[in-house]
């Protein structure tokens, strides 16, 4: 699995609506793949985690000045949606076919 | 400053081309305010850091399994232009107004 | 190597016209902004127009002084810049250089024609 | 339009001495840290060529000797130690707005 010392990339990551308090009204699925961005943005920053030109520069001035200036970040660049029943104000079951920013497409130093 | 128990903000960063050996090829301004985010992600992530559902999930995911799971990072959300003079291909010194993704704009927790 | 050449200036009385044509060789004309610059005799320099990129719609603009009188003009593909000047005017008498380069800076100069308007 | 004034409009300077020419403009030319100056030398019989630009740098193929310093609307151009090539007349430009124009020139002699 992609810890600290490993590049920025996509790792797997489990939610359980339960435990974030969301089965309240959330009815299905009970878990979904959240993904997770996992990993340093070590220089040089490669392609594949698709650096603006801000984050090649404080990955520069970090190289320069490690304890001034933190490294990028890896985050979700690119999000997904997912799809949920839940219950509506009136607590009927409704079907959300594109819910949103849930789940984590693609990852990329920020 | 913003260090790590702040909220995640935009704080200074002056960056001198010299220093990430830009001056090669930048030949104004020599340095530039970059900004950077810092700062924590932290629960309850509040709208000024205008979290993703991503964002919020693995904040919760995190308060509930903090070994497991990071909290979301404070990262560059928004970035504006500088402009910048460089010689072109035949050594003319050109003027570039809008050189993209170079500063920060807005600061975020995704 | 960079060159400019303008054509051969001359001698026009006041009121008259006279086209100034500039050939440019050694850099890729299509990609640099097109100026004329004069210095009227023993006198300083004075911008007289340019003409930005195909990009902008080849935009041009004209000192005060020239304006409504003066256009300028260019052909990329034959890598000419043109200067038609009507109404001549006494004072309009110099060398007229044509000069390339940038939104920044006149990087390259012609060797400059002499127009001369006298009656 | 902004207005460029340079000072001396003459200078006689001997060989191997130092030269100074001033250029003062009518309002900033500095905009996103970038000073839109330049500096040209123009020999008799000669087209103008590019010695300074963005205040301080230097064009290519231009001596050592040659600098430029200033920002804002106070600029200087400097020759460090006078050649008899250096023999010339010196023109600063500026390019922050168009009409983009030009001191009135210094003409620089050998004394």
């Known amino acids: 699995s992609a810890g600290a010392g490993s590049h920025c990339q996509k790792t797997s990551l489990r939610v359980n609506f339960e435990d974030i308090g969301w089965d309240s009204w959330i009815i299905a699925p009970k878990e979904y793949e959240a993904y997770e961005c996992k990993g340093g943005c070590f220089f040089p920053l490669a392609d594949d985690v698709t650096p603006t030109k801000h984050a090649i520069v404080q990955t520069l001035v970090h190289l320069k000045f490690p304890t001034k200036v933190g490294k990028a970040c890896c985050v979700p660049t690119k999000l997904s949606p997912i799809s949920v029943l839940y219950k509506d104000d009136m607590g009927v079951p409704t079907l959300k076919y594109h819910y949103e920013g849930m789940s984590v497409a693609e990852c990329g130093c920020r | 400053s913003a260090g790590a128990g702040s909220h995640c903000q935009k704080t200074s960063l002056r960056v001198n081309f010299e220093d990430i050996g830009w001056d090669s090829w930048i030949i104004a301004p020599k340095e530039y305010e970059a900004y950077e985010c810092k700062g924590g992600c932290f629960f309850p992530l509040a709208d000024d850091v205008t979290p993703t559902k991503h964002a919020i999930v693995q904040t919760l995911v995190h308060l509930k399994f903090p070994t497991k799971v990071g909290k979301a990072c404070c990262v560059p959300t928004k970035l504006s232009p500088i402009s910048v003079l460089y010689k072109d291909d035949m050594g003319v010194p050109t003027l570039k107004y809008h050189y993209e993704g170079m500063s920060v704009a807005e600061c975020g927790c995704r | 190597e960079v060159q400019l050449v303008e054509s051969r200036g001359g001698l026009v009385q006041p009121g008259g016209s006279m086209r100034l044509s500039c050939a440019a060789s050694?850099?890729?004309?299509?990609?640099?902004?097109m100026n004329w610059v004069r210095q009227a005799p023993g006198k300083g320099l004075e911008w007289v127009a340019h003409i930005r990129l195909k990009s902008d719609n080849y935009a041009t603009h004209y000192a005060e002084s020239v304006r409504g009188r003066f256009t300028i003009s260019r052909d990329d593909s034959k890598s000419s810049v043109y200067l038609q000047m009507n109404s001549l005017k006494t004072e309009d008498t110099g060398i007229y250089y044509c000069?390339?380069?940038?939104?920044?800076?006149?990087?390259?100069w012609g060797q400059g024609t002499l127009v001369t308007v006298s009656s | 339009d902004i207005v460029m004034t340079q000072s001396p409009d003459s200078l006689a300077v001997s060989l191997g001495e130092r030269a100074t020419i001033n250029c003062r403009a009518s309002?900033?030319?500095?905009?996103?840290?970038?000073?839109?100056m330049n500096w040209f030398q123009q020999k008799p019989g000669q087209p103008p060529k590019l010695l300074i630009y963005a205040a301080s740098n230097q064009g290519s193929g231009v001596p050592d000797r040659f600098s430029g310093s200033g920002s804002g609307t106070d600029f200087t151009l400097t020759i460090s130690s006078l050649q008899a090539e250096d023999v010339a007349v010196y023109f600063c430009q500026q390019s922050k707005e168009v009409p983009w124009t030009f001191g009135q020139g210094t003409k620089l002699e050998i004394k």
């Open positions: 000069t390339g380069g940038s939104n920044y800076v006149f990087a390259f």
């Open positions: 309002e900033s030319v500095d905009n996103y840290g970038i000073s839109f």
């Open positions: 050694g850099f890729t004309f299509s990609n640099y902004w």
